[in-house]
Amino acid sequence: LTCLGGFASPGPVPPSTALRELIEELVNITQNQKAPLCNGSMVWSINLTAGMYCAALESLINVSGCSAIEKTQRMLSGFCPHKVSAGQFSSLHVRDTKIEVAQFVKDLLLHLKKLFREGQFN
């Protein structure tokens, strides 16, 4: 996470903090992974574009009984606290591909790191 350094100094909290915290949580999950994450549960792949946070939440919420990702679910809810409308929701998912939660987390992490580097904090 060296590219995410430099934000620990005092002073105004940048708008990137929520994104950085989410990235750090995903890093923790991937680094602490011993057995298959969430017992190898499968989730829908998503479009890593507009509405990504809501889409990621909608996909991961279908994994039950996996405490390892509950904090991630709640942090994603920070970006997407109220349900999107039915019209918006239909475009969030790619309902043709399922991947393991571990791969989903890795893909999401890579994309969020890219957004962070590019300064796209919301």
């Epitope: 679910q73 709640r74 920070g78 997407c80 606290p81």
Partner: antibody, heavy 118, light 111 residues
Amino acid sequence: EVQLVESGGGLVQPGGSLRLSCAASGFTFSSYAMSWVRQAPGKGLEWVASISSGDTTYYPDSVKGRFTISRDNAKNSLYLQMNSLRAEDTAVYYCARLDGYYFGFPYWGQGTLVTVSS
Amino acid sequence: DIQMTQSPSSLSASVGDRVTITCKASESVDHSGSSLMHWYQQKPGKAPKLLIYRASNLESGVPSRFSGSGSGTDFTLTISSLQPEDFATYYCQQSNEDPWTFGGGTKVEIK
């Protein structure tokens, strides 16, 4: 330990304004959505406003255009600016951490009383 | 707006009793396999406390005597064996549609 402490309540005349504050501690404030929920004396609960970690705001029609929710992540603080106050806005106003539509409101402050009366 | 109707509005019970509170939504609050219904407990002069989220999930730290069930429009909060600290008012809340709405509350009193 998560703590939410509201302040700023008091007596205000109809048509007046008031700004409520909520000081948060014990969690990474900037990573979570926050809300205000109110409760009129002897009545039930009513959702008033929400703000996402990305500063998107949400309001019911009853307060839209009169109330503004905002946050200052540097100060770990949540605010509710209330304008054009009416008698029916009299209530205890609670600050709550919002863990989204799938998780509800897991943490609440103790509340601050707003009385709108002439 | 989705109307939430709780019943009964109040009830009297004794310590050890099994208590059931129901909440009926004016339209379904189900979404993608989840019921967006939550239950809170409130004691006089205190803030509400989350007990159950998504209809049946026990919030961390909440005693296992509390349970929730239901889907669609009909939901139930059950206290398997009422304890002295459970005398309070209970509210249901939906988050499926803005504005989020609460039920009118059910006051559980000592018989």
